[in-house]
Amino acid sequence: QNASRGRRQRRMHPNVSQGCQGGCATCSDYNGCLSCKPRLFFALERIGMKQIGVCLSSCPSGYYGTRYPDINKCTKCKADCDTCFNKNFCTKCKSGFYLHLGKCLDNCPEGLEANNHTMECVSIVHCEVSEWNPWSPCTKKGKTCGFKRGTETRVREIIQHPSAKGNLCPPTNETRKCTVQRKKCQKGERGKKGRERKRKKPNKGESKEAIPDSKSLESSKEIPEQRENKQQQKKRKVQDKQKSVSVSTVH
């Protein structure tokens, strides 16, 4: 508040400035300050039924200042307003009210929501997401070779996070099962991660099934139909050896 409150000590005529305290230029016993020293703001403070003049370096909370040629004067904002530009335009409301277009409201209008940090009514912001990025290579346990069935993932970014009342964001990860014609891992290739390998076009006849929630899929076990018993695996090895062309397409 930076108060420099002038009060009189002994009885004087209102227009006499000697004996005024603080920032008062002129004062009276009954009304306190009547005018202020240069650059100070004159404000009327209610004390019981009485209004007392005070001189301040700036206007207190709930008041705004006008610098007239002959006096700097504090004027009260509206009752529900803590800081205002003038009588019409509040810039900060008192506790329990929300600011909207210069007015203080109990509740925000339809289509707006209360920001409890700024105590203002703001537009509802809905989630915005980017387009999906391309599918990752088909991998199993981090490898792109030595298997037939694996999973591939794609992601998208959140462009705009939603506000409290905004629409929630849709999933940003999507995982699906993928199938490749199995290829043996080369010597130095065993631990190579999918993202380090060059992507190629998927094989014809690949079957894929998208599952939007990646987290649930990552932790899930293979379903029974996807398990290969020992006999089928042996059969497959024989067939692979008989093939004259080895298919090395990795998806």
């Epitope: 705004y64 006008t66 610098r67 007239y68 040629p69 002959d70 530009f85 003038n86 009588k87 335009f89």
Partner: antibody, heavy 116, light 107 residues
């Protein structure tokens, strides 16, 4: 709805006088400082005078001080501008406006032409 | 008196353009600053007060910024109804002073 309606403009000879009026409605007139702002043809805005809410003090722009007086009648919700010793450079549209640091409400304006 | 230097004095732009008008003030006025819009034959209308706060009914494509001595009015995407003259005003102290105005015309 706030309304400010100016009247009293017209053509007047240099050196003569004119009195403008402004009838206010739709807001608490006695709570507001009131002002006159003018705009010469094709030019910008120029503050002319302000009278505080209770009529006890008035302030004037340098170009009109000593020639113009501003007054108000809060019982009639009316603002006045008495213009004396008019000059050619006083030719402008005169707007009545509620002045509370910014000029929040404006009338439609009344044209004053000073010409011989 | 506080001097206001508004620029440019006129500006040609097309619908959809982003335009910026600036006002330089001769002394520090904090955020005691206002923008008005005036259409031909009409009275001015308060657009922005306290340097950045939109008056009720003013579209959100209008924005104001600045504090101290440098102030800016921006229209993010010009609409046909925005072609008008814009004035700045300091509300820091008497006498109230205005910028010279910026006439925004269709290119």
């Amino acid at each position: 709805e706030v309304q400010l309606v100016e009247s009293g403009g017209g053509v007047v000879q240099p050196g003569r006088s004119l009195r403008l009026s402004c009838a206010a409605s739709g807001f608490t007139f006695s709570d507001y400082d009131m002002a006159w702002v003018r705009q010469a043809p094709g030019k910008g805005l120029e503050w002319v005078a302000t009278i505080i809410y209770d009529g006890s003090r008035a302030y004037f722009g340098d170009s009109v001080r000593g020639r113009f007086t501003i007054s108000r009648d809060n019982s009639k919700n009316t603002l006045y501008l008495q213009m004396n010793s008019l000059r050619a450079e006083d030719t402008a549209v005169y707007y009545c406006t509620a002045h509370d640091r910014s000029f929040d409400y404006w009338g439609q304006g009344t044209m004053v032409t000073v010409s011989s | 008196d506080i001097q206001m230097t508004q620029s440019p004095s006129s500006l040609s732009a097309s619908v959809g353009d982003r335009v910026t008008i600036t006002c330089l003030v001769s002394e520090d006025i904090s955020n005691d600053f206002v923008w008005y819009q005036q259409k031909p034959g009409k009275s001015p209308k308060l657009l922005i007060y306290a340097a950045s706060r939109l008056q009720d009914g003013v579209p959100s494509r209008f924005s104001g910024s600045g504090s101290g001595t440098d102030f800016t009015l921006t229209i993010s995407s010009l609409q046909p109804e925005d072609f008008a003259t814009y004035f700045c005003q300091q509300s820091y102290k008497y006498p109230p002073t205005f910028g010279q105005g910026t006439k925004l015309e269709i290119k």
